[in-house]
Amino acid sequence: DVERTTCPPEKEVHEIDESLIFYKKRELEACVDAALLAAQMDRVDAIPFTYEQLDVLKHKLDELYPQGYPESVIRHLGHLFLKMSPEDIRKWNVTSLETLKALLKVSKGHEMSAQVATLIDRVVVGRGQLDKDTVDTLTAFCPGCLCSLSPERLSSVPPSVIGAVRPQDLDTCGPRQLDVLYPKARLAFQNMSGSEYFVKIRPFLGGAPTEDVKALSQQNVSMDLATFMKLRREAVLPLTVAEVQKLLGPHVEGLKVEEQHSPVRDWILKQRQDDLDTLGLGLQGGIPNGYLILDLSVREALS
């Protein structure tokens, strides 16, 4: 912690200005009034403070605003944002997208994923829902950041906004997030023609149920292997060899490359070997001919 000293008269600070980079840590602590700092935060980012000096300034703001900074201060944090922890950010109430943009720009190139995720969460809470303007801001200034939101927060996305989401924005989304987003995407794109629908829905298919995957297999979509590998394991396992062949079309050959990886490996284990042989890919590990398949899960459910 910064030691307390009195401020030498010649070092008294009446405005936040360039001279402060020549102040030692203890001089900053003694001479900078926290309220002055808060009022002139817009000047701080132009001044190339050292990380140590920024620590002192953060300490001053923390003392002034123990319940969390007001948005007027947050908007102008600039490089001071790099000093914030997720715990600090959780105390904030942020509604302005200008504030979000400013801080996303600052965080670029720094390991700030936890802080950015928390910031975005605070913006969604502050604005009441994940509206189109917020999604547009995220896709423009922080590709992939959409996936930092919890499924609960993502559930506030109106289907009308889904069109603004690009494939790369979903790259880091997990299954639980896609479970939330997929039904919204399905709704958003429901009036499109088959091929156009597939192009739009493809990035969201990691959240699709078996029925929808089966339906796609009837539509000559020629799903690429990358998309297939992102499908939920539970959605892939019930598919027949014929359905997978139809679904992948010419890309079916890729199954050989992926045969050791989930969900392909798990799917192979559930298929009859002679069905797999019809693909002519040399896939091994299917159920040998003549074996009886018992679905124990049904028996367990009845007992």
Epitope: V13, E15, D17, E18, I21, A46, P48, T50, E52
Partner: antibody
């Protein structure tokens, strides 16, 4: 465009004071600091002091007892006053803008200079 | 105070030649976290100094790309790749990491 224009006397009596005004245009003193530098054949370029955008000052310790820098933001003027001049204070005196600003980013070089005020200390 | 030592004092060159000026400081010019406030100025006869390079290697606006700066810590160099007639004058290095700011004694670039 950025300009710094200096006005002040060319001749000063020994033990008297020197006052120079630097009038700036093309930028605001709210955002930029202004340095004072002098140049003499014997001592080369010497940094005398600076008034920062917020009004605070830093002086070269060798001149602190007899130097004062102030400004009037609304008139875009910076005032330099040095007391008790002696013959070895004979030099060309310059005002210069501090590089970068509170709007952009500061880099603490002197990016634009005044035309200079030639000062001779002699009786 | 930080002493800035420039070499050579005088540098005779032919037009089109490369020129190199060295500047050494008596202590490190790295300001606590990374920024190094070492700058180069050119003063032509009868004129005020003009900023050429700031923070070691950044060319100021309007400065031709034949000027380049390099170095770190206490040792710095200004290079002119192909000297032109308009480049003649006195070159000064200066530091603004420590107060008081200080200047080198100057290097006069002149025609051989």
């Amino acid at each position: 465009q950025v300009q710094l224009k200096q006005s002040g006397p060319g001749l000063v009596q020994p033990s008297q004071s020197l006052s120079i005004t630097c009038t700036v245009s093309g930028f605001s003193l709210f955002s930029y600091g202004v340095h004072w530098v002098r140049q003499s054949p014997g001592k080369g370029l010497e940094w005398l002091g600076v008034i920062w955008s917020g009004g605070s000052t830093d002086y070269n310790a060798a001149f602190i007892s007899r130097l004062s820098i102030s400004k009037d933001n609304s008139k875009s003027q910076v005032f330099f006053k040095m007391n008790s001049l002696q013959a070895d204070d004979t030099a060309m005196y310059y005002c210069a803008r501090n590089g970068g600003s509170m709007i952009t980013t500061l880099y603490y070089a002197m990016d634009y200079w005044g035309q200079g005020t030639s000062v001779t200390v002699s009786s | 105070d930080v002493v800035m030592t420039q070499t050579p004092l005088s540098l005779p060159v032919s037009l089109g030649d490369q020129a190199s000026i060295s500047c050494r400081s008596s202590q490190s010019l790295v300001h606590s976290y990374g920024n190094t406030y070492l700058h180069w100025y050119l003063q032509k006869p009868g004129q005020s100094p003009k900023l050429l390079i700031y923070k070691v290697s950044n060319r100021f606006s309007g400065v031709p790309d034949r000027f380049s700066g390099s170095g770190s810590g206490t040792d710095f160099t200004l290079k002119i790749s192909r000297v032109e007639a308009e480049d003649l004058g006195v070159y000064f290095c200066s530091q603004s990491t420590h107060i008081p700011f200080t200047f080198g004694g100057g290097t006069k670039l002149e025609i051989k």
